[in-house]
């Protein structure tokens, strides 16, 4: 988790002087509770936005937006703590909006936005906005949280972001898999425009089960430049194991931008359909 660039971040708007500061995610008001605290944020919205760095790289960011409730507690609102928690790693990053002037009611509802948390493809986050100061230990909570799922690199807009392109998202191998006679699979895919090797992983499963019954690898050496964008054809021999009939083929490239952690593409061959056996017709009619 990180913030997009480190140029000065602003949260000021007409009628409010505000600055964005790094936060330890442990506001002082936890340790020194105040008597009067503001109410919680209203209408917290998290959206996927895209932003360029100063170097021109494009990254997915969490666009966080919320409004204030129209009650007198805004007189005690000193700022907000924005927290983003990556759920699979428990990594957390926070920033603090510090209000340098007192808020006053005006004809429009106060609205705040922040779009500088860089998020990763195919990850889930919990976004929390805490109004500051935080409540006393038994006080009503004054935060709002929402979960936010970032699409993977198959998503049209995500595909062209720097992290996705670095992991090989622009390569479309257009995998085809056909079953041949004598327990063989013919795998065909389009090579990318880079002289790098590929690894094919075949995993076979019984019908309707997820425990593999056979696993095999095939290594494809780096193609020559004249083979770029050409189809590569590989014949894999299956093991004649009864019922081991559903096959998943994964292709892992080793592009220079992602090395041994590139996006894999896969195709699956289902077990052949079993013909429905018709009910046997008795050759005599019972008399009862």
């Amino acid at each position: 988790l990180r913030l997009l660039d480190h140029r000065a971040l602003v949260c000021s708007q007409p009628g409010l002087n505000c600055t964005v500061k790094n936060s330890t995610c442990l506001d002082d008001s936890w340790i020194h509770p105040r008597n009067l605290t503001p109410s919680s944020p209203k209408d917290l919205q998290i959206q996927l936005h895209f932003a360029h760095t100063q170097q021109g790289d494009l990254f997915p960011v969490a666009h966080i937006e919320w409004t204030l409730q129209t009650d007198a507690s805004i007189l005690y609102l000193e700022g907000a703590e924005l927290s983003v928690l990556q759920l699979n790693t428990n990594e957390r990053l926070c920033v603090r909006f510090e209000f340098l002037s007192k808020l006053r009611h005006h004809h429009r509802r106060w609205r705040f936005t922040f779009s500088h948390f860089v998020v990763d493809p195919d990850q889930e986050y919990e976004v929390t906005v805490h109004h500051l100061p935080k409540p006393i230990p038994d006080g009503d909570p004054n935060h709002q949280s929402k979960n936010f799922l970032v699409p993977d690199c198959e998503h049209a807009r995500m595909k062209v972001t720097t992290p996705c392109m670095s992991s090989g998202s622009l390569w479309d191998p257009n995998i085809t898999v056909e079953t041949l006679e004598a327990h063989q699979l013919r795998v065909s895919f389009t090579l990318w425009n880079e002289s790098t090797h590929y690894q094919i992983l075949l995993t076979s499963f019984p019908h309707m089960e997820n425990h593999s019954c056979f696993e095999h690898m095939h290594h494809i050496p780096a193609p020559r430049p004249e083979e770029f964008h050409q189809r590569s054809n590989v014949t894999l021999t299956l093991r004649n194991l009864k019922g081991c009939c559903r096959h998943q083929v994964q292709i892992q490239p080793f592009f220079s931008s992602c090395l041994n952690d590139c996006l894999r593409h896969s195709a699956t061959v289902s077990c052949p359909e079993m013909p429905d056996t018709p009910e046997p017709i008795p050759d005599y009619m019972p008399l009862w």
Partner: nanobody, 112 residues
Framework: EVQLVESGGGLVQAGGSLRLSCVAS???????MAWYRQAPGKQREFVAH???????NYADSVRGRFTISRDNSKNTLYLQIDSLKPEDTAVYFC???????WGQGTQVTVSS
């Protein structure tokens, strides 16, 4: 959390032998496994793999000199490397392709 830990590397003279080991902790493996290697300033390259039934395949440059094997009861993958050449100098990595797990590598240096 699955971890792959390689060992057995070292400095050896040309023509010598080593046996590399890779222990998988945190899970049992009966899956396809592989060895890769990476020489300084070069791309990581395939060395050998073994499938779930014990079938093996080797890169042309090591065929006949290297032998991949496994002991599922010990959760261990091996690479026996014989008739070593200076061009075999590299960091050797163990790979569990199904989950794309990689070890940290073990250094093999062959002196002429």
């Amino acid at each position: 959390e699955v971890q792959l830990v390689e060992s057995g590397g070292g400095l050896v003279q040309a023509g010598g032998s080593l046996r590399l080991s890779c222990v998988a902790s945190g899970s049992t493996f009966g899956n396809a496994m592989a060895w890769y290697r990476q020489a300084p300033g070069k791309q990581r390259e395939f060395v050998a793999h073994i499938n779930s039934l014990g079938g093996t395949n080797y890169a042309d440059s090591v065929r006949g000199r290297f032998t991949i094997s496994r002991d599922n009861s010990k959760n261990t993958l091996y690479l026996q490397i014989d008739s070593l050449k200076p061009e075999d100098t590299a960091v050797y990595f163990c790979n569990w392709p199904r989950y794309n797990y990689w070890g940290q590598g073990t250094q093999v240096t062959v002196s002429s």
